[in-house]
Interface confidence: low
């Protein structure tokens, strides 16, 4: 991301990551994908987990990893904070385990900054309910 010319941010073209509070990204992402199409392919494998509803932050978290936020002001992509990762992992890892899957190493929470500050910028994400209840369904983009 050396000079301004190369640094241009790209619109997010992955439908499940649109309308999440930021709309531009820059590849490669935080797991090494150079193309959004490759990122989208891997993101779709998480769709059942998103649909399950284990964490209201899951979709935002995954998008922040696979299409991290880009801003013209900083020359590095802004991904998730470790705290959001841990919150999502705490809720969703048991669901994954129940269906015979392990928490992916690519989403190892130690890879992400513990909190957002000037030295390590990251996204805290939307607030999460302490217990996910059907009557308090995850607030999603476009909620009325």
């Amino acid at each position: 991301f050396g000079d301004e010319e190369e640094r241009r941010c790209d619109p997010i073209r992955i439908s499940m990551c649109q309308n999440l509070g930021y709309n531009v990204t820059k590849m490669p992402n935080l797991v090494g994908h150079e193309l959004q199409t490759d990122a989208e392919l891997q993101l779709t494998t998480f769709t059942p987990l998103i649909q399950y509803g284990c964490s209201s932050q899951l979709q935002f978290f995954l998008c922040s990893v696979y299409v991290p936020m880009c801003t013209e002001k900083i020359n590095i992509p802004i991904g998730p904070c470790g705290g959001m990762c841990l919150s999502v992992k705490r809720r969703c890892e048991p669901v994954l385990k129940e269906f015979g899957f392990a928490w992916p190493e690519s989403l190892n929470c130690s890879k992400f900054p513990p909190q957002n500050d000037h030295n390590h910028m990251c996204m805290e994400g939307p607030g999460d309910e302490e217990v996910p209840l059907p009557h308090k369904t995850p607030i999603q983009p476009g909620e009325e």
Partner: antibody, heavy 118, light 110 residues
């Protein structure tokens, strides 16, 4: 307030078609499973079809596969069930429903009656 | 596809009785099991989700539990408004048949 309102039910002859609508309010259908569940007179609940429209995933019960099509128009916040080649055994009250955590159906519509008879 | 065998199909009980309804899955399933109450002419109402979590606004006399492939709905002290039909629902992770309902249990006044 979350609401689901079905419409489109009625009397149809065997082999005919009908399209049911489910108008949702109070939430965005793009980010929830929407299901159609039916109940024949005096019988139990039978799952018919489901859609998760933000990912374009659809699912069908074997009994309706190839005859019924579930769809959604997110701009209208409405889900549909297109029913073709209807049979007498499709006679039922059809409920539109929404599920959230762990596929628990937390909101149901009032139901619309479909009668297939000659 | 997974079958959910619900038993009994009907039962007679008195106000104050403890009532237990069971659903047995035909194969190992997740805890994505819900229980519903339905009264004649009305849509079902969610009671229990994730096998044992009480849905908001549902009286605490209702509870759910799991033991292997057996899922149980218990009404600790039956009330007059509890006479209804109860259904279990199992949901798959990702597959052909997303939702399976049990056959229902009608709880009648003795």
């Amino acid at each position: 307030e979350v609401q689901l309102v079905e419409s489109g039910g009625g009397l149809v002859q065997p082999g005919g078609s009908l399209r049911l609508s489910c108008a949702a309010s109070g939430f965005n259908i793009s980010y929830y499973y929407i299901h159609w569940v039916r109940q024949a007179p005096g019988k139990g609940l039978e799952w018919v079809a489901s859609i998760y429209s933000s990912s374009s995933y659809t699912y069908y019960a074997d009994s309706v596969k190839g005859r019924f099509t579930i769809s959604a128009d997110t701009s209208k916040n409405t889900a549909y069930l297109q029913m073709n080649s209807l049979r007498a055994e499709d006679t039922a009250v059809y409920y539109c429903a929404r599920s959230s955590y762990a596929w628990a159906i937390d909101y149901w519509g009032q139901g619309t009656l479909v009668t297939v008879s000659s | 596809d997974i079958q959910m065998t619900q038993s009994p199909s009907s039962l007679s009980a008195s106000v104050g009785d403890r009532v237990t309804i069971t659903c047995r899955a035909s194969q190992s399933v997740s805890s994505a099991v819900a229980w519903y109450q339905q009264k004649p002419g009305k849509a079902p109402k969610l009671l229990i989700y994730s096998a044992s979590s009480l849905y908001s606004g549902v009286p605490s006399r209702f509870s759910g539990s799991r033991s292997g492939t057996d899922f149980t709905l218990t009404i600790s002290s039956l009330q007059p408004e509890d006479f209804a039909t109860y259904y279990c629902q199992q949901s798959g992770w990702w597959g052909v048949s997303l939702i399976t309902f049990g056959q229902g249990t009608k709880v009648e006044i003795k």
